[in-house]
């Protein structure tokens, strides 16, 4: 018989991963704060309107490979980090927005300051 | 094997502070979160908060913040919750257990908080 | 906080009976992203610490008898024990584990009769 307290070796289950959330916060959220079996991530893009708009959130750990790859997408401009290496690692995640191709000026619309 | 060794039993003076102790072994303890749950007569579970030992990140029930302190020593394993300004509300068992997803996979045997001049 | 309430708080029941408990959640347990869910069952014996026999509401943890059922969606979930031994003499609790603060149901007395 187990002692109380005791029990077999444990198997092997993802651990929760709490990470910041905005702008894509689930609705199992808490005081912005998701939680994942993945990664967190910080993405920064254009809006329809050419502003750079911040979002950070969870990713689940399927496909999360590929969206955490930054992969350039045509006249979009976007980038993403992702990380799991502590709680709320997105906290420190800056990623900026790739520059502007040539082609980009000629096609996209002209932001004034 | 896993194993959660918490003491039996803790007497503490009204006013006091206590620290609780979970010892682990039997897995990674970075690996899991530890929880702790108060359970008194008649009362059912209450969740008090938890630690991640990787990060000493935790997460407290509002109904505890200022009442537990949650800490982990990677070390030696352990667990501990320091307790402050007890009251006879505070006589319970309190449980240490690990969790992968917020479900509790292995409990500790629980220690009876006791508290009385 | 998601409240938990289970019934009956207990129930009187012969060796070889089929036994069935409920418990509801003030909002669903049920997580869009991956259609889980998140409500797990404990049993605490006299003496002894809780044990974990169902999580995500449907998966038997490891080592327990296939009489314990974990069923139910949503805010509704039943816990059976298809023909109760007399080892089943215990307190049982449903537990959410969709968001934090984490919280229990009151409990379920199992007595035999």
């Known amino acids: 018989k187990k002692e109380d307290g005791e029990s077999t070796a444990p198997t092997p289950r993802p651990k929760i991963l709490r990470c910041k959330c905005h702008h894509h916060c689930p609705e199992d959220s808490v005081n912005n704060i998701c939680s994942t079996d993945g990664y967190c991530f910080t993405m920064i893009e254009e809006d329809d309107s050419g502003m750079p708009v911040v979002t950070s959130g969870c990713l689940g750990l399927e496909g999360s490979d590929f969206q955490c790859r930054d992969t350039p997408i045509p006249h979009q401009r976007r980038s993403i980090e992702c990380c799991t290496e502590r709680n709320e690692c997105n906290k420190d995640l800056h990623p900026t927005l790739p520059p502007l191709k040539n082609r980009d000026f000629v096609d996209g619309p002209i932001h004034h300051k | 094997q896993v194993q959660l060794q918490q003491p039996g039993a803790e007497l503490v003076k009204p006013g006091a502070s206590v620290k609780l102790s979970c010892k682990a072994s039997?897995?990674?303890?970075?690996?899991?979160?530890m929880h702790w749950v108060k359970q008194r007569p008649g009362q059912g579970l209450e969740w008090i908060g938890d630690i991640d030992p990787s990060d000493r990140y935790t997460n407290y029930n509002q109904k505890f913040k200022g009442k537990a302190t949650l800490t982990v020593d990677t070390t030696s394993s352990t667990a501990y919750m320091q307790l402050s300004s007890l009251t006879s509300e505070d006589s319970a068992v309190y449980y240490c257990?690990?969790?992968?997803?917020?479900?509790?996979?292995?409990w500790g045997q629980g220690t009876t908080l006791t508290v009385s001049s | 906080d998601i409240v938990m309430t289970q019934s009956p708080s207990s129930l009187a029941m012969s060796v070889g009976q089929k036994v069935t408990m409920s418990c509801k959640s003030s909002?669903?347990?049920?997580?869009?992203?991956?259609?889980?869910?998140?409500l797990a069952w404990y049993q605490q014996k006299p003496g002894q610490s809780p044990k974990l026999l169902v999580y995500f509401a449907s998966t038997r943890e490891s080592g327990v008898p296939d009489r314990f059922i974990g069923s139910g969606s949503g805010t509704d979930f039943t816990l059976t024990i298809s023909s109760v031994q007399a080892e089943d003499l215990a307190d049982y609790f449903c537990q959410q584990h969709y968001n934090i603060p984490l919280t229990f149901g009151a409990g379920t007395k199992l007595e035999l009769k």
């Open positions: 039997g897995y990674t303890f970075t690996s899991y979160w």
């Open positions: 257990a690990i969790s992968g997803w917020d479900y509790f996979d292995y």
């Open positions: 909002q669903s347990l049920l997580k869009s992203s991956n259609q889980k869910n998140y």
